[in-house]
C-alpha cells in the first residue's frame, strides 16, 4: 500500500511486530527439522551474522540473513521459509546488496548447515526481541 513507510524506516513498534511474527515460524521450522533430522550436529563452519553492529539497540541484519533462507528454501519447508522471507523483506534496508550463498554439496554437511542456520536465526530473534523489550518502555 502507498501508506506504508519504506521498509527501512519502520519504527521499533513495527519491528517488534515483525519479530513476533517471525519467532513462531522460526521455532516451528527448527523443531520440525530437529525431529526429522535426528543426530545431525551443528556446524562450526557456519556463522550467521544476523545482527548489525552499527545500531543501538542492535537490529536484525535482514540483508545478511535473507540469502541463507533463499539458499535453504528448496531443501526445507518452502511454505514456512516463504513466510520468513516475506517478513525479512520488510526489515531489509533498500538497496542493500545480498550475497550469494552456496549450500554444501555433501548431504550430511548440508543438513548440518541447515540446522545451524535455523538455530542461529532463532537465537538471533530472541536476542533482538529482548533488546526491543528492554528499551525505554
Amino acid at each position: 500500500s502507498s501508506h506504508m513507510a519504506p521498509t527501512h524506516q519502520l519504527p521499533p513498534s513495527d519491528v517488534r511486530k515483525i519479530i513476533l511474527e517471525l519467532q513462531p515460524l522460526s521455532r516451528g521450522l527448527l523443531e520440525d527439522y530437529q525431529k526429522k533430522e535426528t543426530g545431525v550436529p551443528e556446524s562450526n563452519r557456519t556463522l550467521l551474522l544476523c545482527l548489525t553492529s552499527d545500531s543501538q539497540p542492535p537490529r536484525l541484519n535482514s540483508s545478511a540473513i535473507l540469502p541463507y533462507f533463499r539458499a535453504i528454501r528448496p531443501l526445507s519447508d518452502k511454505n514456512i521459509i516463504d513466510k520468513i522471507i516475506e517478513q525479512l523483506d520488510k526489515l531489509k534496508f533498500q538497496h542493500e546488496p545480498e550475497t550469494e550463498i552456496s549450500v554444501p554439496a555433501d548431504t550430511f554437511e548440508c543438513k548440518s548447515f541447515i540446522l545451524t542456520i535455523l538455530q542461529q536465526f532463532s537465537a538471533c530473534l530472541e536476542s533482538v526481541f529482548k533488546s526491543l523489550n528492554s528499551g525505554p518502555q
Epitope: 500500500s1 501508506h3 506504508m4 513507510a5 519504506p6 521498509t7 527501512h8 524506516q9 519502520l10 519504527p11 521499533p12 513498534s13 513495527d14 517488534r16 511486530k17 515483525i18 513476533l20 511474527e21 513462531p24 520488510k90 528499551g135 525505554p136 518502555q137
Partner: antibody
Framework: EVQLVESGPSLVKPGGSLRLTCSVT????????WKWIRKFPGNKLEYMGY???????DYNPSLKSRITISRDTSKNQYYLQLNSVTTEDTATYYC????????????WGQGTSVTVSS | DIVMTQSPASLSVSLGQRATISCRAS??????????MHWYQQKPGQSPKLLIY???NLESGIPARFGGSGSGTDFTLTIDPVQADDVATYYC?????????FGGGTKLEIK
C-alpha cells in the same frame, strides 16, 4: 467501506470478566493488525493490545496478566477478554484496524461503553 | 512509556480563523527521518477519524484545511480556516514505540 462494530455487556460486576466482540466488515481480519483501545471517563486513552493477521497477540504490559485477545476468522470477529475487573476498568472500548506497517490506525469502531459496578 | 502532552485542553476559535493544537512527546518519535505521530478527530457519538498520519500526511478524503507539521518531539495540527463542522475533540498519538500512547485531547469550540 471498512466497518468495525463493538458489542458486549454494558454492565459488569467487580471481580468478573468483561468480554467484547469486534465485528469487521469490508476487510478480512486475516490481513493487518486488529487493535483494542479504551477511553476512560475524562477522555484519557489507553492502548490495550492487538491480534495480528496470523493470530499473534501482543498486549500493553500494564494489562498483560488480565487481558486476552482472540478471534474467529470464520465470523470475521475478534474479541477482548479482561479478567478481574474493577471500577477502574469503566471506560468506552474501541476496536480499530492497523492495516500496514509504518501507517496509522485508519478505521475505528464507534465504541461501546462498559461500566463496572456492583 | 512515551508520554504525550497535548495543549491546549480546550480551544475556542472564530469561524474562518486558524486553530493550532500542539502535541509534545517525552522522547523523539522519529526514525530515519519519519515521525510516527498521528492525529485524529472525534465528534460526540461518532467513531474516531484519522486526519493526519506520520506527522504531516493528509489522510485520503480529509479536507486540505487540515495540516500537520513537526518532528522529533514537537508536533502541531493546524485547521485553517475553521468551519462549524470542525467542532470535535482532537487527539494525537505515537506509534513509534510500544505501548502506543495518546495525548489528552483538545476540545475545539466555535466562538
Amino acid at each position: 467501506e471498512v466497518q468495525l462494530v463493538e458489542s458486549g455487556p454494558s454492565l459488569v460486576k467487580p471481580g468478573g470478566s468483561l468480554r467484547l466482540t469486534c465485528s469487521v466488515t469490508g476487510d478480512s481480519i486475516t490481513s493487518g493488525y486488529w487493535k483494542w483501545i479504551r477511553k476512560f471517563p475524562g477522555n484519557k486513552l489507553e492502548y490495550m493490545g492487538y491480534i495480528s493477521y496470523s493470530g499473534i497477540t501482543d498486549y500493553n504490559p500494564s494489562l498483560k496478566s488480565r487481558i486476552t485477545i482472540s478471534r474467529d476468522t470464520s465470523k470475521n470477529q475478534y474479541y477482548l477478554q479482561l479478567n478481574s475487573v474493577t471500577t477502574e476498568d469503566t471506560a468506552t472500548y474501541y476496536c480499530a484496524r492497523y492495516p500496514n506497517y509504518g501507517y496509522a490506525m485508519d478505521y475505528w469502531g464507534q465504541g461501546t461503553s462498559v461500566t463496572v459496578s456492583s | 512509556d512515551i508520554v504525550m502532552t497535548q495543549s491546549p485542553a480546550s480551544l475556542s476559535v472564530s469561524l474562518g480563523q486558524r486553530a493550532t493544537i500542539s502535541c509534545r512527546a517525552s522522547e523523539s518519535v522519529d526514525t530515519y527521518g519519519r515521525s510516527f505521530m498521528h492525529w485524529y478527530q472525534q465528534k460526540p457519538g461518532q467513531s474516531p477519524k484519522l486526519l493526519i498520519y506520520r506527522a504531516s500526511n493528509l489522510e485520503s478524503g480529509i479536507p486540505a484545511r487540515f495540516g500537520g507539521s513537526g518532528s522529533g518531539t514537537d508536533f502541531t495540527l493546524t485547521i485553517d480556516p475553521v468551519q462549524a463542522d470542525d467542532v470535535a475533540t482532537y487527539y494525537c498519538y505515537q506509534s513509534y514505540e510500544d505501548p502506543w500512547t495518546f495525548g489528552g485531547g483538545t476540545k475545539l469550540e466555535i466562538k
